[in-house]
């Protein structure tokens, strides 16, 4: 099965990686 989604754009867009930490570590166990 194939499905698509998208947002209108006239040219290639950059995906925003800004929602995720750049060099993540595991959550500390508490």
């Amino acid at each position: 099965s194939e499905t698509t989604t998208g947002t209108s754009s006239n040219s290639s867009q950059s995906t925003s990686n800004s929602g995720l930490a750049p060099n993540p570590t595991n959550a500390t166990t508490k």
């Epitope: 754009s9 290639s12 995906t15 990686n17 800004s18 929602g19 930490a21 993540p24 959550a27 500390t28």
Partner: antibody, heavy 115, light 112 residues
Framework: EVQFVESGGGLVQPGGSLKLSCAAS????????MDWVRQASGKGLEWVGE??????????YYAESVKGRFTISRDDSKNTAYLQMNSLKTEDTAVYYC??????WGQGTLVTVSS | DIVMTQTPLSLSVTIGQPASISCKSS???????????LNWLLQKPGQSPKRLIY???KLDPGIPDRFSGSGSETDFTLKISRVEAEDVGIYYC?????????FGGGTKVEIK
């Protein structure tokens, strides 16, 4: 228009394997950190894993529940990310979404693990 | 793992009225670079999720300014200043500060 096209879902028996693909267009794919997120029917969202870009050495991260069974890879020349799923369990049954670092999302592909 | 707890579980709102959703994390989401990786997503009925807000309060392109995010450390809020019919769906908070990335259980918003 940004599009993420997922394919490869279907019915598989417990213990079996399946490979999902996520083809991207309209986006600078080589810069995207690609995540896979799943959603069981009527349930919430569960992160599966992630592969980063070339400057980040294509590092991968996985949820504990799939570690050692699932493998994420990517082919920047094809603008495609992959999720290889081995040793599948009934609890892996879900709609699997690919997403560019939670920014753009595909519409999902259904994976059903059942005998 | 960081546990994300959303309240309320569901919300019935009159069109044009405000709405507020709370999200609490079991650990601080403040990352070493001074940024806080708290995202809000909306999953409309029958659709895939869509990110509305990242880094607590930054609106994604194309997201109406009636949506706003606030908070810090472990306590976050999504506010809709005036709810519209198109805002119905399930809202999720999600943390991207520490592995594994984790989501809240979701808040279902419906129209009265």
């Amino acid at each position: 228009e940004v599009q993420f096209v997922e394919s490869g879902g279907g019915l598989v028996q417990p213990g079996g394997s399946l490979k999902l693909s996520c083809a991207a267009s309209g986006v600078t794919f080589s810069e995207a950190w690609m995540d896979w997120v799943r959603q069981a029917s009527g349930k919430g969202l569960e992160w599966v894993g992630e592969i980063r870009d070339k400057p980040n050495s294509y590092v991968t991260y996985y949820a504990e529940s799939v570690k050692g069974r699932f493998t994420i890879s990517r082919d920047d020349s094809k603008n495609t990310a992959y999720l290889q799923m081995n040793s599948l369990k009934t609890e892996d049954t879900a709609v699997y979404y690919c997403t560019g670092a939670m920014d753009y999302w595909g519409q999902g592909t259904l994976v059903t693990v059942s005998s | 793992d960081i546990v994300m707890t959303q309240t309320p579980l569901s919300l019935s709102v009159t069109i044009g009225q405000p709405a507020s959703i709370s999200c609490k994390s079991s650990q601080s989401l403040l990352y070493s670079n001074g940024k806080t990786y708290l995202n809000w997503l909306l999953q409309k009925p029958g659709q895939s999720p869509k990110r509305l807000i990242y880094q607590v309060s930054k609106l994604d392109p194309g997201i109406p300014d009636r949506f706003s995010g606030s908070g810090s450390e472990t306590d976050f809020t999504l506010k809709i200043s005036r709810v519209e019919a198109e805002d119905v769906g399930i809202y999720y908070c999600m943390q991207g500060s520490s592995l594994p990335w984790t989501f809240g259980g979701g808040t279902k918003v419906e129209i009265k």
